[in-house]
Amino acid sequence: MAVTACQGLGFVVSLIGIAGIIAATCMDQWSTQDLYNNPVTAVFNYQGLWRSCVRESSGFTECRGYFTLLGLPAMLQAVRALMIVGIVLGAIGLLVSIFALKCIRIGSMEDSAKANMTLTSGIMFIVSGLCAIAGVSVFANMLVTNFWMSTANMYTGMGGMVQTVQTRYTFGAALFVGWVAGGLTLIGGVMMCIACRGLAPEETNYKAVSYHASGHSVAYKPGGFKASTGFGSNTKNKKIYDGGARTEDEVQSYPSKHDYV
């Protein structure tokens, strides 16, 4: 039961995280005009990965897309790439994890296959979360650098007569959404990896049956088991296939009277 809960929770947390990463990537408020210690402007500027917007005190908002690829800063391109890679990996991870869920039965899929899929999706979620966190952090670092640069020459005077107010930008809501979403995706991925360990069928204790032929002392290893070292061996024999029914979260299956001929 604990494995199913861990896997299910990991899936839900990752789903929320990836939805958040998508939302953050689409949001316009990656950087917002710094209002602190600034003259009160009747215009509010904010920028996203794909367009920049201006909201006037009149209520009108105008957004303009970045219609150039080559003219954009390399850092912005890198952030875009990281966020898109994060979304793509996350989406594939979600798709894989749906089929890996214990509560969903697809044909006669083996637990080992589900375990592998769970681990794969878990790793994908971890990488996806890391991509989002990295992307947001790179953008935040870019903002901090630009903020202090513009603070250094906030007012550029023309002969000391006319002043031009330089617009400074600070962290927008999208950064916080991105950090939280990336963290959730990462946590979800870790949970999926933990669930994978529980899903993987563990080696079980089996006693190998020994048949003595005349003049020989050969230990017969029944099919369906890995070779044992001999009669009465306590070595764990990993079962390759078990046709019998088992409970949802059964980690070990013990031999029954039907296991041996």
Partner: antibody
């Protein structure tokens, strides 16, 4: 079509109070009060976001004038306290538009502060 | 507060003349976010409410004749009437629409010569 109709102007004694109203019909996101003293130029008084009620005032009017709105009546107000002779002017309400320009204006209401 | 200085304070012109009014602000009204200058021009006739002519320094308000045009960026702006008509004799105001408090120029009165 947006229509703005001011009312509430009149004669008031120095130190007195007056409340101006501006009936608004049509869509408005933010509104302003602008005044014009006889034979003088235009002077911006205050701005308000009609949705949040967030106000902004010109320095000369902070503390004395209060801009507000009543959503149910779709009316803009300007409460004027501690009135002085120099507050004598025609008061206009105006709607903020694109570029923060004032595209619609009321007909104006005259406020006379005199003893 | 932003100071708006208009010149001339008054001018006499004839119908058909080209008229230019200048406006200077104490700080740049150019917004880096959209590269637009938040300067507005109004026309006011005696006893009437002002009328919006131009916003964003150069964008003509709908219904305003094309003989009116605005130009400028940063701190220096110009209103031009290419061919003065009888109905254009009025007072013209420029306005800072970028910083609170919004401030108006002292006005330029265009009179008949």
């Amino acid at each position: 079509e947006v229509q703005l109709v001011e009312s509430g102007g009149g004669l008031v004694q120095p130190g007195g109070s007056l409340r101006l109203s501006c009936a608004v019909s049509g869509y408005t996101f933010s509104m302003n009060w602008v005044r014009q003293a006889p034979g003088k130029g235009l002077e911006w008084v205050a701005w308000i976001n009609m949705y949040t009620g967030e106000p902004t005032y010109a320095d000369d009017f902070k503390g004395r004038f209060t801009i507000s709105r009543d959503d149910s009546k779709n009316t803009l107000y300007l409460q004027m306290n501690s009135l002085r002779a120099e507050d004598t002017a025609v008061y206009y309400c105006a709607r903020s538009s694109r570029g923060n320009g004032f595209d619609y204006w009321g007909q104006g209401t005259l406020v006379t502060v005199s003893s | 507060d932003i100071q708006m200085t208009q010149s001339p304070s008054s001018l006499s012109a004839s119908v058909g003349d080209r008229v230019t009014i200048t406006c200077k602000s104490s700080q740049s009204l150019l917004n880096s976010g959209n590269q637009k200058s938040y300067l507005t021009w109004y026309q006011q006739k005696p006893g009437k409410a002002p009328k919006l002519l131009i916003y964003w320094a150069s964008t003509l308000e709908s219904g305003v004749p094309s003989r009116f045009s605005g130009s400028g960026s940063g701190t220096d702006y110009t209103l031009t009437i290419s061919s003065l008509q009888p109905e254009d004799f009025a007072t013209y105001y420029c306005q800072n629409a970028y910083f609170f408090p919004f401030t108006f120029g002292q006005g330029t009165k265009v009179e008949i010569k």
